[in-house]
Amino acid sequence: VPRWRQQWSGPGTTKRFPETVLARCVKYTEIHPEMRHVDCQSVWDAFKGAFISKHPCNITEEDYQPLMKLGTQTVPCNKILLWSRIKDLAHQFTQVQRDMFTLEDTLLGYLADDLTWCGEFNTSKINYQSCPDWRKDCSNNPVSVFWKTVSRRFAEAACDVVHVMLNGSRSKIFDKNSTFGSVEVHNLQPEKVQTLEAWVIHGGREDSRDLCQDPTIKELESIISKRNIQFSCKNIYRPDKFLQCVKNPEDSSCTSEI
């Protein structure tokens, strides 16, 4: 008799999830000499241990602590780039500006990027059929709790000027409900961080509006100022040109405002 299985509203675990996590870990530790000491089998065991045999709506940050410990990594605290709803451009930027880091440039972020996973209460099986959706099912699911945990730690580590890339094409350029708005903003440490610098990325070719005056940006400024951190904002009118000038600031096309 087939065992009854909970049907969740979200997509199931990414196929070949264990193999993908293990392969990514091996690749990352080969590329990053400072992480060569990491035992990827232990990393996978700790990752698995965070959600296997547990109810996928009852996951806690505590469940991920063994994984957090194994994945401990020091990135330059003044070279952190946060992002919200504009992941691809943020990653393109750090691929060029190699000394800056998004969360997905760290081991733990790299392992989990774009993946979904969950288990089932009291069985050692991974659920490839469905996983809880944050809105429709529950917020304390394995994926959401993972990203909340690593995002909090990443923000806590930041210092000096922290940069955040925001999507100027969205109706809410700053969204209080995003990971940036609900976790990272509130975990920047005022005793270490002097300024949060927002880069608002324009989507339209001819969009010359000052999106730093957007009401949601003003809301972000207010939240940050109340936390005793300064705030600054810059419009990036031409993201393609911005990336080009990061690659080569001496390029002749970089002699005007970006």
Epitope: D160, E197, Q230, K234, V246, P249, T255, E257
Partner: nanobody, 122 residues
């Protein structure tokens, strides 16, 4: 290339004020982070303050509340307003530039001025 020229350094009494200027030419000034460093007699060059292309400011702990960095993109100039000066602020003050992002490490700045001497003494 970015050319930088500092000015404004002079002899000043303890407790006094001074405003240093750094005029830039050669590239689009507004795309560059600008910083002030200083080198006292027999000391290493040390970070004082920086301002990014987006106007984010960054200060060394020893100048917080006394010094203010600002920029005027229309004039291609960065300023360092120095108040409540102390004898230990005596140094050659250098202006530096790098693409976009404000950081503390001198090695990360590509362009440097020749420096301007500030002496705090009674």
């Amino acid at each position: 290339q970015v050319q930088l020229q500092e000015s404004g350094g002079r002899l000043v009494q303890p407790g006094g004020s001074l405003r240093l200027s750094c005029a830039a030419s050669g590239r689009t000034f507004s795309n560059y982070a600008m910083a002030w460093f200083r080198q006292g007699p027999g000391k290493e060059r040390e970070f004082v303050a920086a301002i990014s292309a987006a106007d984010s400011t960054l200060y060394a702990d020893f100048v917080k509340g006394r010094f203010t960095i600002s920029r005027d993109n229309a004039k291609n100039t960065v300023y360092l307003q120095m108040n409540s000066l102390k004898p230990e602020d005596t140094a050659v003050y250098y202006c530096a530039a790098r693409w976009w992002i404000a950081v503390r490490a001198p090695a990360e700045y590509n362009y440097w001025g020749q420096g301007t001497q500030v002496t705090v003494s009674s």
